[in-house]
């Protein structure tokens, strides 16, 4: 269950529930947010003030990371099995340090197993954080400091810092270093959505939300 | 320098087991996955399976699932490729081939191969 | 599964000449590309991979290009130690699949 059921069950606070992993009794705690366009949105990435170290493990990756009231990641085996499970959606919401928001939208969003390293993939971009999507397409697979998967014979997670669907960079790492503001330019490694904010630009703050397409 | 050495082959009745072994020296065993490849005599490559670097996650073609399996000692630096029900199919040079990452699919380094012969 | 078709399966050059090998997929495999060398008796080496990144040790008389589902291998000028066979593989999903092979020869 995920936070559109926990909205429909009359839960419609925002805040920290025990979600269940599907098909199994597997628990994991996440945010939910039940207010932005009409709630039941489950936030499976937050950054917001550099107090969690996303350079970390393919494991960790994984199995989630952080603190869901702050900065974390929610897990990317409990996103594959959710996603895999019916359709979703995937908002990006992003500010920059000058007080403007974004977002982009993909009507269709899910990951792969971790046999194809969690790949991603994407449909139907909107939104108003650039016409073209700064997640390559078609979708690579995931990468990590320790599990190099990407397209460059840099390595891109080493090299740009935090796990992330590299391709050879790519045009995108909402998981890379968190830099504060006045340092937040030219920086190669920062929290990069290259479509909106271009290459050298560390963004403020971050949440990637998914919710049922059918919500 | 990355070394892969393969070991165990030989020549095997059909329908028995054989048990051929990698060596591997020369960089962090533990932090790749491994594969293993065969090619007929005279014919083209076949990739047969892969485990990760932690041993948690192996996946096979259907030509030799459920008769084959792979597996590692890190403590050893050893790789494993145990095969079962042999038929005279199976015959080829099996090697053994280091990942370029924990599980990246891209195959890295190759061992000189051992020789598996099925014939009664 | 995704099945690789190599072309030609054997091709007859002499030293200096420029060389091209295709490789198509059946299906998009997105980059995830590589190529192989193998020498008569000898284990297969890593070319290329993604397509078009050179490994270590490689000489940039290599090359590689391609998207979707068609893939080349290209050899700017042959040399005498670059007659063998060469193969590509998808590693875009299990299982990996490879190309028959291109054997090159001198002629």
């Known amino acids: 269950r995920d936070c559109a059921e926990v909205f429909k069950s009359g839960h419609t606070t925002n805040g920290i529930y025990t979600l269940t992993f599907p098909n199994s009794t597997e628990e994991i705690k996440a945010y939910c947010d039940m207010e932005a366009g009409g709630g039941g949105w489950t936030i499976i990435q937050r950054r917001e003030d550099g107090s969690v170290d996303f350079q970390r493990t393919w494991k960790e990756y994984k199995v989630g990371f952080g603190n869901p009231s702050g900065e974390y990641w929610l897990g990317n085996e409990f996103v594959s099995q959710l996603t895999n499970q019916q359709r979703y959606v995937l908002k990006i919401h992003l500010k920059d340090w000058e007080g403007n928001e974004a977002y982009s939208l993909y009507e269709h969003f899910y990951l792969s197993s971790e046999e194809l390293n969690y790949r991603i993939h994407l449909k139907g971009l909107t939104g108003t954080a650039g016409k073209i999507s700064s997640i390559s397409q078609p979708g690579n697979d995931f990468s990590t400091k320790d599990g190099d998967n990407d397209k460059c014979i840099c390595k891109c997670s080493q090299m740009l810092t935090g796990g992330w669907w590299f391709d050879a960079c790519g045009p995108s790492n909402l998981n890379g270093m968190y830099y504060p503001q006045r340092q937040n330019t030219n920086k190669f490694n920062g929290i990069k959505w290259y479509y909106w904010k271009g290459s050298g630009y560390s963004l403020k703050a971050t949440t990637m939300m998914i919710r049922p397409a059918d919500f | 320098q990355v070394k892969l050495v393969e070991s165990g082959g030989g020549v095997v009745q059909p329908g028995r087991s054989l048990r051929v072994s990698c060596a591997a020296s020369?960089?962090?065993?533990?932090?790749?996955?491994m594969h293993w490849v065969r090619q007929a005599p005279g014919k083209g490559l076949e990739w047969l399976a892969i485990?990760?670097?932690?041993?948690?996650?192996?996946y096979y073609s259907d030509s030799v699932k459920g008769r084959f399996t792979i597996s590692r000692d890190n403590s050893k630096n050893t790789l494993y490729l145990q095969m079962n029900s042999l038929r005279a199919e199976d015959t080829a040079e099996y090697y053994c081939?280091?990942?370029?990452?924990?599980?990246?699919?891209?195959?890295?380094?190759w061992g000189q191969g051992t020789l598996v012969t099925v014939s009664s | 599964d995704i099945q690789m078709t190599q072309s030609p399966s054997s091709l007859s050059a002499s030293i200096g000449d420029r060389v091209t090998i295709t490789c198509r997929a059946t299906q998009d495999i997105n980059n995830y590309l590589a190529w192989f060398q193998q020498k008569p008796g000898k284990a297969p080496k890593s070319l290329i991979y993604?397509?078009?990144n050179l490994q270590s040790g490689v000489p940039s008389k290599f090359s590689g290009s391609g998207s979707g589902t068609d893939y080349t291998l290209t050899i700017s000028s042959l040399q005498p130690e670059d007659f063998s066979t060469y193969y590509c593989q998808q590693y875009h999903s299990y299982p990996l699949t490879f190309g028959g092979g291109t054997k090159v020869e001198i002629k």
């Open positions: 081939v280091r990942d370029a990452s924990i599980a990246s699919r891209f195959l890295d380094y």
């Open positions: 485990i990760w670097y932690d041993g948690d996650n192996k």
């Open positions: 993604a397509t078009s």
């Open positions: 020369g960089f962090t065993f533990s932090s790749y996955g």
